[in-house]
């Protein structure tokens, strides 16, 4: 993701217009306070991605962070996020507004808590105070984020000077809350499943010795128990465990199980839940499809990902022209299939520095007994632009006829061009374009040809030059994504005794 | 500047529906976000729903939850709630309001723009 202009923070004159503009070779959008405002979202001729988000005539309320993320299906685990943060101080708001329920800060234990006064200048100097009390706390301050620390059970509010004149927060009211030290832990071996597989789910507690679980799982609404097994794992820290296992799952035992663990010593007590889903039969999907035509560049490595969902595991083939490939020995074909997450599975080719032979159709596969999918592309090896020859030829009736003959993928565009002062030429001199011309002082004709087997195009391009009174330095430059090439060849009038 | 006007408002009984409008002139419709905030006598004024400038997301209080949709109609300049099962305690005046970012938060503080708002009245 690439963030333009860069960041990481920005300061902006209020009422003024500031464009942010996000690129990536996937779809991203904008994101501020976990929503999408308005923006403009492009793919680009390169085949990149933009999203740009204008802020115009902008107040106080803009400071704050944004995000530019990508906008995909893989979920928050492949999913990159930039952040970045904007000011805009604004003399009239000081502190930034905050919701009722903000105020309230809840501390489940002694650990650092943000109390969340910002203010719109990052200049501004803020202190935090006790409210009963006038004195400022020794706390330090983000301006981003607030006041960050351990704070005790009392009200503070912040403070800070806008010009002359003194600016209160809002009131905070810290609180702490006396939770359950019981540290409870589930998990399951596997969180999907097929009818007739085994389910095993385990509820592990630390550190303390005289607990009591209780389960609840979709078995129990039809009245059908299933007795859990307690494990005791004595060490330090000791554990101990209940298993729930159903050996054979049905369709109905799809859902949430939970696992409620209580200390009769203490009434302290604490649950945590799992959902597991019973499929009927496997499944193998493609989470993201490849365009039709892929691109790599001839001597270039490049990496062709396919992400896909499925259980139980697949098996993955990758073919290119309906032959299987497989890690070569060389190292020119990487070949990689890894799981992700639990039924999410990312599968690369990777080539490297990439042949012309490497062009063609690919094909991954990937299957088990239950279900299969596929995907294929065509890889189009693009090669840099070559002019192989500029040949010139003399026919009886006075023409001068040159044939610029050049290969290329994708196909090259041919420009011919001339110049006449040689010696400022072409240096200090811009060539003039040559083509058909009305006056039929030129005359131009292009044949392509592609060659299957080197998988390129040839360009012959041939200007026949009705006359030439003096010398001319005349330019065959070919032209393609990948670059550009050019020969030139100095042409003569038939009567000047010139060799070049 | 953007002008917000709501109508739709009435009185009603309890379990009946009504759809406030909210029409909105004098800016780019489209890139606003927009939001339903009541206000009952005596009470603070509250978020109901929200919907995103381009209607793909939308926020509602969990009170609403499965009653009202929010919805809008770039081409016509509006926004929608559609009020389904009234409530005695659904009585207040409604107002639109517009956020000029695209956002469609439940904080107040957001919104540019605000309308003068709608009484709808559910009595039992």
């Known amino acids: 993701l690439v963030i333009t202009p860069p960041g990481p923070e920005f300061v902006l004159n209020i009422s003024s217009t500031f464009v942010l503009t996000c690129s990536s070779s996937a779809p991203v959008m904008w994101e501020q306070m976990s929503q999408v405002p308005w923006q403009e979202a492009a793919m680009n001729q390169d085949g990149t991605f933009s999203s740009v988000l204008t802020l115009t005539n902008v107040t106080g309320g803009d400071t704050g962070e944004y995000f530019c993320v990508y906008n995909n299906s893989l979920g928050p685990e492949l999913s990159e996020r930039k952040r970045i943060y904007i000011f805009v101080p604004d003399p009239t708001m000081g502190f930034l507004p905050m919701d009722s329920e903000d105020l309230f800060i809840f501390v489940t234990d002694v650990t650092e808590t943000t109390i969340p006064c910002r203010v719109t200048d990052p200049q501004l100097e803020v202190t935090l105070h006790e409210k009963k009390v006038d004195i400022p706390l020794h706390v330090p301050y983000d301006h981003q984020r607030g006041f960050i620390g351990t704070f005790e059970d009392k009200t503070y509010i912040c403070k800070t000077t806008i010009g002359d004149r003194e600016v209160d927060s809002d009131t905070y009211y810290v609180y702490s809350l006396q939770v359950s030290s019981i540290n409870v832990s589930v998990n399951a071996v596997q969180t999907v499943v097929r009818q007739g597989e085994s389910i095993t789910i385990r509820c592990i507690v630390m550190g303390n010795d005289v607990v009591n679980f209780q389960w609840t799982y979709p078995r129990m609404k039809s009245g059908r128990l299933v007795e859990p097994v307690t494990d005791y794992l004595f060490g330090v820290p000791s554990r101990i465990g209940s298993i729930l296992h159903i050996p054979t799952a049905e369709l109905s035992d799809s859902g949430t199980y939970t696992c409620n663990v209580s200390v009769s010593v203490n009434d302290h007590g604490d649950e945590k839940a799992i959902n597991v889903t019973v499929i009927e039969n496997g499944y193998v999907r493609l989470l993201e499809t490849l365009e039709d035509v892929q691109i790599a560049e001839l001597h270039r490595s490049r990496t062709l990902q396919v992400v896909f969902e499925a259980y139980p595991t697949p098996s993955v083939l990758w073919f290119k022209d309906n032959r299987t490939l497989g890690d070569s020995s060389a190292g020119e074909l990487v070949l990689s299939t890894r799981n992700v997450s639990e039924t999410r599975y990312v599968s690369e080719l990777t080539l490297v520095r990439v042949k012309v032979s490497e062009a063609g159709y690919y094909t991954m596969r990937a299957f088990h007994a239950d279900d299969q999918v596929q995907l294929s592309f065509k890889l189009q090896v693009n090669v840099p632009v070559r002019v192989l020859e500029l040949s010139e030829s003399h026919p009886a009736n006075g023409e001068q006829i040159l044939r610029c003959r050049g290969r290329g993928m994708p196909q090259p565009n041919v420009t011919w061009s001339t110049c006449r002062d040689l010696k400022r030429c072409p240096r200090k001199l811009s060539p003039t374009p040559l083509g058909n011309s009305s006056k039929e002082e030129s005359q131009l004709e292009t044949n392509v040809t592609f060659w299957e087997e080197d998988q390129e195009y040839e360009v012959v391009s041939t200007l026949r030059l009705r006359h030439v009174d003096q010398p001319l330095s005349v330019r065959c430059m070919l032209q393609n994504s990948m670059g550009r090439d050019s020969q030139e060849v100095t042409v003569v009038p038939h009567s000047l005794p010139f060799k070049v | 500047e953007v002008q917000l006007v709501e109508s739709g408002g009435g009185l009603v009984q309890i379990g009946d529906s009504l759809r406030l409008s909210c029409a909105a002139s004098?800016?780019?419709?489209?890139?606003?976000?927009m939001g339903w905030f009541r206000q009952a006598p005596g009470k603070e004024r509250e978020f109901v729903a929200a919907?995103?400038?381009?209607?793909?997301?939308?926020n509602y209080a969990d009170f609403v939850k499965g009653r009202f949709t929010i919805s809008r109609y770039n081409a016509k300049n509006t926004a929608y709630l559609q009020m389904n099962s009234l409530k005695p305690e659904d009585t207040a005046v409604y107002y639109c309001?517009?956020?000029?970012?695209?956002?469609?938060?439940?904080?107040?503080?957001?919104?540019?723009?605000w309308g003068q708002g709608t009484q709808v009245t559910v009595s039992s």
């Open positions: 004098g800016g780019t419709f489209n890139r606003y976000g």
């Open positions: 919907i995103r400038w381009d209607g793909v997301d939308t």
């Open positions: 309001a517009a956020d000029r970012r695209g956002l469609y938060t439940k904080h107040a503080h957001r919104y540019d723009y």
